[in-house]
């Protein structure tokens, strides 16, 4: 089948990084600057993505692969292939329509992105709270109250929160 196809369609011989040029008798021509083709047999090359503004170039465009963008410091990627950049907040905050807001009591965010989440309910697993939660940290669950030796204190004060904490991904 492959051989038959190549006899019928000369374009199938054009490798990645080239396109099948109809204007030149279907000769394989290299992709022009700022364009690419990632598969063989293409009749056109795709325009390279440009990383502008809040986007910065993570990987340059080549004749066979598109450019890849990430976000400038203070922002993080959202969406497939980093289609958007969203503002970072501090640990202990979440991004709302009105900007970065502190987590409500009983919730935390240990990253610079994402939402404030409720502290883990240790009792769900029959455990007790070993370390209290803060705005920046979840609780740490410990053994069930029955497992604690008599007189042992079950709750440790939270560890002091420190930057950078959980780095944005």
């Amino acid at each position: 089948f492959e051989r038959t196809r190549s006899l019928q369609d000369p374009c199938s011989n054009c490798p990645a990084g080239t396109f099948c040029d109809n204007n030149r008798n279907q000769i394989c021509s290299p992709c022009p600057p700022n364009s690419f083709s990632s598969a063989g047999g293409q009749r056109t090359c795709d325009i390279c993505r440009q990383c502008k503004g809040v986007f910065r170039t993570r990987k340059e465009c080549s004749s066979t692969s598109n450019a890849e963008c990430d976000c400038t410091p203070g922002f993080h990627c959202l969406g497939a292939g980093c289609s958007m950049c969203e503002q970072d907040c501090k640990q202990g905050q979440e991004l709302t329509k009105k900007g970065c807001k502190d987590c409500c009591f009983g919730t935390f965010n240990d990253q610079k992105r994402g939402i404030c989440r409720p502290w883990t309910n240790c009792s769900l697993d029959g455990k007790s709270v070993l370390v209290n939660g803060t705005k920046e940290r979840d609780v740490v669950c410990g053994p069930s109250p029955a497992d604690l030796s008599p007189g042992a204190s079950s709750v440790t004060p939270p560890a002091p929160a420190r930057e950078p904490g959980h780095s944005p991904q």
Partner: antibody, heavy 119, light 107 residues
Framework: QVQLVQSGAEVKKPGASVKVSCKAS????????INWVKQAPGQGLEWIGN????????NYNQKFKDKATITADKSTSTAYMELSSLRSEDTAVYYC????????????WGQGTTVTVSS | DIQMTQSPSSLSASVGDRVTITCRPS??????LNWYQQKPDKTVKLLAY???RLRSGVPSRFSGSGSGTDFTFTISSLQPEDIATYFC?????????FGQGTKLEIK
């Protein structure tokens, strides 16, 4: 009891993709983070990323961001990790793990899935 | 990323010996340090979390201590069933990172 059961060993050709599954039982699947960890032959452990099944929020190790895609299906209490554009360096045992109650430690480990990439 | 320097990479000890493994993160991780045991059959088990809290069912001969950038894991009296590789892991900052492991053998 809490259990994570992973899919069986896979042999793949370079350039192919593989999807490893991790079926959870014995607890509320949506309330705990599921992590994925890589162990290459004779090597240590590397954290790939995690997912919170309740809302499918994910974190990735930058090193694996273009390699791994982590998903979860609440209806079957199953987490998945897909590895794309496989190369020989991806040959490893992959573990899924569940947190202990808060994300900071991994209390339950699956039995591991061996992925072999060979032409 | 936080680097976890674990030592020794391997050690051989006799039954009844006291065995100590150290783990040094490249930056302060407070108490967010966990210890795991990987048996020769590749099964992995969490032994201790939040520096020194033993999981229920883990024998009391295991203990963990330290904080910040210096952590120690001790087996007070080595038993034959302790033959395994032990890993430390920091849970303070993403991406989570592991020590390279300590392979423990019986003399």
């Amino acid at each position: 009891q809490v259990q994570l059961v992973q899919s069986g060993a896979e042999v793949k050709k370079p350039g192919a993709s593989v999807k490893v599954s991790c079926k959870a039982s014995g607890y509320t699947f949506t309330s705990y983070w599921i992590n994925w960890v890589k162990q290459a032959p004779g090597q240590g452990l590397e954290w790939i990323g995690n997912i919170y099944p309740s809302d499918s929020y994910t974190n990735y190790n930058q090193k694996f961001k273009d390699k791994a895609t982590i998903t979860a299906d609440k209806s079957t209490s199953t987490a998945y990790m897909e590895l794309s554009s496989l190369r020989s360096e991806d040959t490893a045992v992959y573990y899924c793990t569940r947190d202990y109650g808060s994300a900071y430690s991994m209390s339950t480990w699956g039995q591991g899935t061996t992925v072999t990439v060979s032409s | 990323d936080i680097q976890m320097t674990q030592s020794p990479s391997s050690l051989s000890a006799s039954v009844g010996d006291r065995v100590t493994i150290t783990c040094r993160p490249s930056q302060d991780i407070s108490n967010y340090l966990n210890w795991y045991q990987q048996k020769p059959d590749k099964t992995v088990k969490l032994l201790a979390y939040y520096t020194g809290r033993l999981r229920s069912g883990v024998p009391s001969r295991f203990s963990g201590s330290g904080s910040g950038t210096d952590f120690t894991f001790t087996i007070s009296s080595l038993q034959p069933e302790d033959i395994a590789t032990y890993f430390c892991q920091q849970g303070d900052t993403l991406p989570y990172t592991f020590g390279q492991g300590t392979k423990l053998e019986i003399k």
